[in-house]
Amino acid sequence: RPSFSLVEDTTLEPEEPPTKYQISQPEVYVAAPGESLEVRCLLKDAAVISWTKDGVHLGPNNRTVLIGEYLQIKGATPRDSGLYACTASRTVDSETWYFMVNVTDAISSGDDEDDTDGAEDFVSENSNNKRAPYWTNTEKMEKRLHAVPAANTVKFRCPAGGNPMPTMRWLKNGKEFKQEHRIGGYKVRNQHWSLIMESVVPSDKGNYTCVVENEYGSINHTYHLDVVERSPHRPILQAGLPANASTVVGGDVEFVCKVYSDAQPHIQWIKHVEKNGSKYGPDGLPYLKVLKHSGINSSNAEVLALFNVTEADAGEYICKVSNYIGQANQSAWLTVLPKQQAPGREKEITASPDYLE
């Protein structure tokens, strides 16, 4: 049963297809696993700054340092990836800036191309110089943490030398890694000192250790694999938007709703209204009216502009966004003041970030 009574139809989608729509995208900061990352909150005049990751409050810890408007992440891991926000709290309002952090090792995904140089890794030694195993190309082993999208190919390399030529074996989570441990098995290219797993799945997550040994010694190196899943997701709305606003009778006001969505979003601006002097229908559900929606005749649907407002415009405004996966909505309140109670200036617009198309 719908949770409201409709004055105008609000369905999952409009009857006419929406226009092609440019969705706001947060800035993306990319770091390789193990690296440190520093981000400055791009908001002005902040009295107090609070940070969130994926909507959850972020506090300082042994790897996360929060100093003023800076966020530092030391020794980034794939788990640090996500949607971050800094919120600047001021005496009269607050403002939020969003950014993405992507901690990923692009090299680990499908990099068979560099196998052409693998022959260099196969070092032949003078038979008289007996030598324990040693790494011949530590550069190719620096990235220990590999975050890879599901279904991609992963290659781990441990280029080594020694005399006699060492052998290589692989462990998963400290135990012998057998072909039957994963669907499709894996490939070991001894010539290139590599382990290759195709079409990785979440169960492939874990620690992979190469053990390189000969009769004179043994060395090992461990990689951590994180398999990142990709699934369709419903729209994400920027926290704190739309923001509450106030203006005087006759003033103008603007509400902003920032949307993140892979799939085409349909944006609706909805207001609680009265019908026959009542805010609720016979079923006890509130009356709602669609003020604007993304469609053929709609301009920038992420912004709702109200001009020459009257006291009747006061109330709650809902930004409702749907795609084929699901919905999200957030709301804000408009306070309309009589002219004699003007809040310092004739027109007051919400203190929200500039709209970026």
Epitope: P2, S3, L12, H233, R234, Q264, I325
Partner: antibody
Framework: QVQLVQSGAEVKKPGSSVKVSCKAS????????MHWVRQAPGQGLEWIGA????????SYNQKFKGRATITADKSTSTAYMELSSLRSEDTAVYYC???????WGQGTTVTVSS | DIQMTQSPSSLSASVGDRVTITCKAS??????VAWYQQKPGKAPKLLIF???YRYTGVPSRFSGSGSGTDFTFTISSLQPEDIATYYC?????????FGQGTKLEIK
């Protein structure tokens, strides 16, 4: 794990109605649309409509508007699709699918025959 | 409604072949296209969404590309288990329409 379990096969007379259920588990039922898709024997896929269980919002293919009714019961995490005024060409397998069409029910065969 | 025209309607290929299926939308749908695999008597399985995102657990031999009105689905090296019917679908606007399907057979 995510599962969508549909009700069993139905045989119906022309002019009657059928109500197919789809019980969801393994995820938050109210957070995703539930779509209904049908497939006539030897034919392609046809989208019927969808519901967002959190607030009951529905969307229908105009072809089925007035004949199809999609509902959801949040308390049992079950979605329903009722099709009325059945005719022989409604004979098909009816599927429910979660929001991103990433999980599908096993299908319910509805046969309309006099 | 947005029409999705899929071609070919059927095709025969050998194991190891590169297979390509195309889908044309009757209007601009940006990158809002998904591809599904359906085997007889089974529900469809999502392979690709948003034109090029491979769904979780889908083998890397499956890929998708395109935007606007023209979309391509590719199997880089056909495997015996890939024998099925493949459908494209636009998820840009309701009603979410499907292509008529491509039946893939082994030579």
């Amino acid at each position: 794990q995510v599962q969508l379990v549909q009700s069993g096969a139905e045989v119906k007379k022309p002019g009657s109605s059928v109500k197919v259920s789809c019980k969801a588990s393994g995820y938050t039922f109210t957070s995703y649309n539930m779509h209904w898709v049908r497939q006539a024997p030897g034919q392609g896929l046809e989208w019927i409509g969808a519901i967002f269980p959190e607030n009951g919002d529905t969307s229908y293919n105009q072809k089925f508007k007035g004949r199809a009714t999609i509902t959801a019961d949040k308390s049992t995490s079950t979605a329903y699709m009722e099709l009325s005024s059945l005719r022989s060409e409604d004979t098909a397998v009816y599927y429910c699918a979660r929001g991103g069409f990433d999980y599908w029910g096993q299908g319910t065969t509805v046969t309309v025959s006099s | 409604d947005i029409q999705m025209t899929q071609s070919p309607s059927s095709l025969s290929a050998s194991v190891g072949d590169r297979v390509t299926i195309t889908c044309k939308a009757s209007q601009d749908v940006s990158t809002n296209v998904a591809w599904y695999q359906q085997k007889p008597g089974k529900a469809p399985k999502l392979l690709i969404f948003s034109a090029s995102y491979r769904y979780t657990g889908v083998p890397s031999r499956f890929s998708g590309s395109g935007s606007g009105t023209d979309f391509t689905f590719t199997i880089s090296s056909l495997q015996p288990e890939d024998i099925a019917t493949y459908y494209c679908q636009q998820h840009y606007s309701s009603p979410y329409t499907f292509g008529q399907g491509t039946k893939l057979e082994i030579k």
